[in-house]
């Protein structure tokens, strides 16, 4: 589709994706991988590593399949990292997710790509 | 401050003539963002009209104009227009020129506006 | 194309008083929509951005929400000022508007 049409083609467009399949999660109305919880995890100092890391602890769980697959594009670090959480803090996947959508659109409207 | 001036319309045009309208922008990085055309008929909605990427070598028009005008712009001069052709009676709108909200993107949400150039078609 | 429509068309409101405006799209446009105030004679204004964001200057009173193919614009509680034209746009393929709605006073 013409619009938005990224320049700078890659980075954008993956971060484009990303915000489209976190907002069709956030659509759905039924619990989240069973409600899982997620450790919650600093987004601006770790990013999507940690959001990576985090979300790696759910199995069998479809929803987030998609957007796991684009974390692990977007995360281009060598060898795993410790999850950056909050001590001691976890919160149900689905809130992880709306934090994870916020901390992206930021991003992509704010750059620097 | 960041501003948008059009200019071009103003007078009556015959069905079938032509117009180039032109939009004049300032205060900001000109040639690092995308810009648009969007019309709008006496008492009537928003209808957009015409896009055009950052350097000018993406173009997008709506279907009902599609054809008949052409968008284009002079990074140098930070200018971009939009050449009117075979002009029909519903092409009757005020005409606006629109800045896209981030530079990255073609085809966004409009943060600044020109105050519009009107174009009348009639004979 | 993407179809935007807009319900209601009009509405009368008093000052105070919150409102809402719904904006339906024909297919998914995920959250690219935007929302626009005009008053008569002047340019759009830009309100609301990627479904949900305000932009910069726009006071707090108005807000948007929803994704997919169905979106809202609240206003809060309305001013004086806020007596206008309201128009969504989706720019998730090139760019359409919904018809508008005009919120007269009561």
């Known amino acids: 589709a013409p619009g938005p049409v990224p320049r700078s083609v890659s980075l954008p467009l993956t971060l484009k994706e990303l915000i489209e399949e976190l907002s069709n999660i956030t659509q759905d109305q039924t619990p989240l991988c069973n409600g899982s919880m997620v450790w919650s995890v600093d987004l601006a100092a770790g990013g999507f590593c940690v959001a990576l890391d985090s979300l790696t602890n759910i199995s069998n769980c479809n929803a987030i399949y998609r957007t796991q697959r684009i974390l692990h594009g977007l995360c281009n670090r060598k060898a795993p990292t410790t999850v950056s959480s909050l001590p001691d803090t976890k919160i149900e996947v689905a809130h992880f997710i709306t934090k994870l959508l916020s901390y992206t659109k930021q991003l992509f409207r704010h750059g620097p790509f | 401050q960041v501003q948008l001036q059009e200019s071009g319309g103003g007078g009556l045009v015959q069905p079938g003539g032509s117009l180039r309208l032109s939009c004049a922008a300032s205060?900001?990085?000109?040639?690092?963002?995308?810009m648009s055309w969007v019309r709008q008929a006496p008492g009537k909605g928003l209808e957009w009209v015409s896009s055009?990427?950052?350097?000018?070598?993406?173009?997008f028009y709506a279907d009902s104009v599609k054809g008949r005008f052409t968008i284009s712009r002079d990074n140098n001069k930070n200018m971009v227009f939009l050449q009117v052709n075979s002009l029909r009676a519903d092409d009757t709108a005020v005409y606006f020129c629109?800045?896209?909200?981030?530079?990255?993107?073609?085809?966004?949400?409009?943060?600044?506006w020109g105050r519009g150039t009107t174009v009348t078609v009639s004979s | 194309d993407i179809q935007l429509t807009q319900s209601p068309s009009t509405l009368s409101a008093s000052v105070g008083d919150r409102v809402t405006i719904t904006c339906r799209a024909s297919?998914?446009?995920?959250?690219?929509v935007a929302w626009y105030q005009q008053r008569p004679g002047k340019a759009p204004k830009l309100l609301i951005y990627?479904?949900?964001t305000l932009q910069s200057g726009v006071p707090a009173r108005f807000s948007g929400s929803g994704s997919g193919t169905e979106f809202t614009l609240t206003i809060s509680s309305l001013q004086p000022d806020d007596f206008a034209t309201y128009y969504c746009?989706?720019?998730?393929?090139?760019?359409?508007f919904g018809q508008g709605t005009k919120v007269e006073i009561k």
């Open positions: 629109a800045k896209d909200w981030s530079q990255w993107l073609v085809g966004d949400a409009f943060d600044v």
């Open positions: 205060g900001f990085t000109f040639s690092s963002y995308g």
């Open positions: 055009i990427s950052a350097s000018g070598d993406s173009t």
């Open positions: 297919q998914s446009v995920s959250l690219w």
């Open positions: 990627d479904g949900s």
């Open positions: 746009q989706q720019y998730k393929t090139f760019s359409t």
